[in-house]
């Protein structure tokens, strides 16, 4: 039975050319996290964090994605095209699959605020 909940950084904004941290947190379950996938709005995988194999950054994102902190992901050298939805998918046992959503808005403005509040989607 899936009892857990995913908390995410929710809707965030960041400056073009800057960087942003995408964070998800799985709570309210004792399930083992075997893998976390990070995906972009068009279903392309950015990175995988496997409990045994560690991090795998997909080639298309190698230059702009850094693993961590923790199970999170850091996006660097942001462009306007990075605006959109990002999903963290927690593969766990015995529960199964948990998914969290983050919406990132990349702003031209130099006064872009980076909100880091956690919320349950």
């Amino acid at each position: 039975m899936m009892t857990g909940t995913i908390e995410t950084t929710g809707n965030i904004s960041a400056k073009k050319g800057g960087s942003v941290i995408l964070q998800c947190h799985l709570s309210s379950t004792m399930a083992q996290v075997t893998q976390v996938n990070w995906e972009q709005h068009d279903h392309s995988l950015l990175a995988i964090r496997n409990a045994e194999l560690g991090w795998h950054i997909y080639p298309a994102f190698k230059d702009r994605v850094a693993p961590g902190p923790g199970l999170g992901l850091t996006l660097q050298s942001l462009t306007m095209n990075d605006t959109g939805e990002y999903f963290c998918t927690y593969h766990t046992y015995p529960d199964g699959t948990y998914r969290g959503r983050i919406f990132l808005e990349v702003l031209e403005s130099s006064v872009a605020e980076h909100s880091a509040r956690f919320q349950i989607p």
């Epitope: 083992q32 075997t34 995988i48 409990a51 045994e52 046992y93 015995p94 529960d95 199964g96 699959t97």
Partner: antibody, heavy 119, light 107 residues
Framework: EVQLVESGGGLVKPGGSLKLSCAAS????????MSWVRQSPEKRLEWVAE????????YFPDTVTGRFTISRDNAKNTLYLEMSSLRSEDTAMYYC????????????WGQGTSVTVSS | DVQITQSPSYLAASPGETITINCRAS??????LAWYQEKPGKTNKLLIY???TLQSGIPSRFSGSGSGTDFTLTISSLEPEDFAVYYC?????????FGGGTKLEIK
């Protein structure tokens, strides 16, 4: 080319044991989680075991927990399923399958090996 | 466990036609449903995963849709090689479970 070749099936009496093998080739075996799925004579598919890439994590449905053991030898590119206390309802074709790297479903399957439990 | 009900169990169609196969889960499985093709003498083939994502190398005439409890596999402009048995499988929670299969035959 990804290839999975199962072996070790056969006829066994109720209460008996059997060890199935799956030889993998054409991919880096040690970086993929693997599963065993069986198909009953009535053609129903049932997932029976899964193991993580390094062998640390193993998972089973309640129907086989305590009777089946899944293991792997990454040096030999081989997956195993050890079955004990076999019952007539375990009669099936057993397939090994590779899980996608992102864990979404099973992307390659073997041809299967037949297991018959009968007295 | 999540029960998967697949329908129809049997379907007859002609090459060039468009067909749909349905799977219904006993509870929400988000988007996490896969579709497989089984043909005699061949290994099972993954067609669709995560509800609608086409597996690499699978022709675009195969498509998947749905989320929550109701899912559909659509094969448009049937080719002779598409006549086979199709299974759905939920990959949302353990234990992974399968539908009962749909045998697609030539009319």
């Amino acid at each position: 080319e990804v290839q999975l070749v199962e072996s070790g099936g056969g006829l066994v009496k109720p209460g008996g044991s059997l060890k199935l093998s799956c030889a993998a080739s054409g991919f880096t075996f040690s970086t993929y989680a693997m599963s065993w799925v069986r198909q009953s004579p009535e053609k129903r598919l049932e997932w029976v075991a899964e193991i993580s890439s390094g062998g640390t994590y193993t998972y089973f449905p309640d129907t086989v927990t305590g009777r089946f053991t899944i293991s792997r030898d990454n040096a030999k590119n081989t997956l195993y399923l050890e079955m004990s206390s076999l019952r007539s309802e375990d009669t099936a074709m057993y397939y090994c399958a590779r899980k996608r790297r992102d864990y979404y479903a099973m992307d390659y399957w073997g041809q299967g090996t037949s297991v018959t439990v009968s007295s | 466990d999540v029960q998967i009900t697949q329908s129809p169990s049997y379907l007859a169609a002609s090459p060039g036609e468009t067909i749909t196969i349905n799977c219904r889960a006993s509870k929400s499985i988000s988007k996490y449903l896969a579709w497989y093709q089984e043909k005699p003498g061949k290994t099972n083939k993954l067609l669709i995963y995560s509800g609608s994502t086409l597996q690499s190398g699978i022709p675009s005439r195969f498509s998947g849709s749905g989320s929550g409890t109701d899912f559909t596999l659509t094969i448009s402009s049937l080719e002779p090689e598409d006549f086979a048995v199709y299974y759905c499988q939920q990959h949302n929670e353990y234990p992974w479970t399968f539908g009962g299969g749909t045998k697609l035959e030539i009319k």
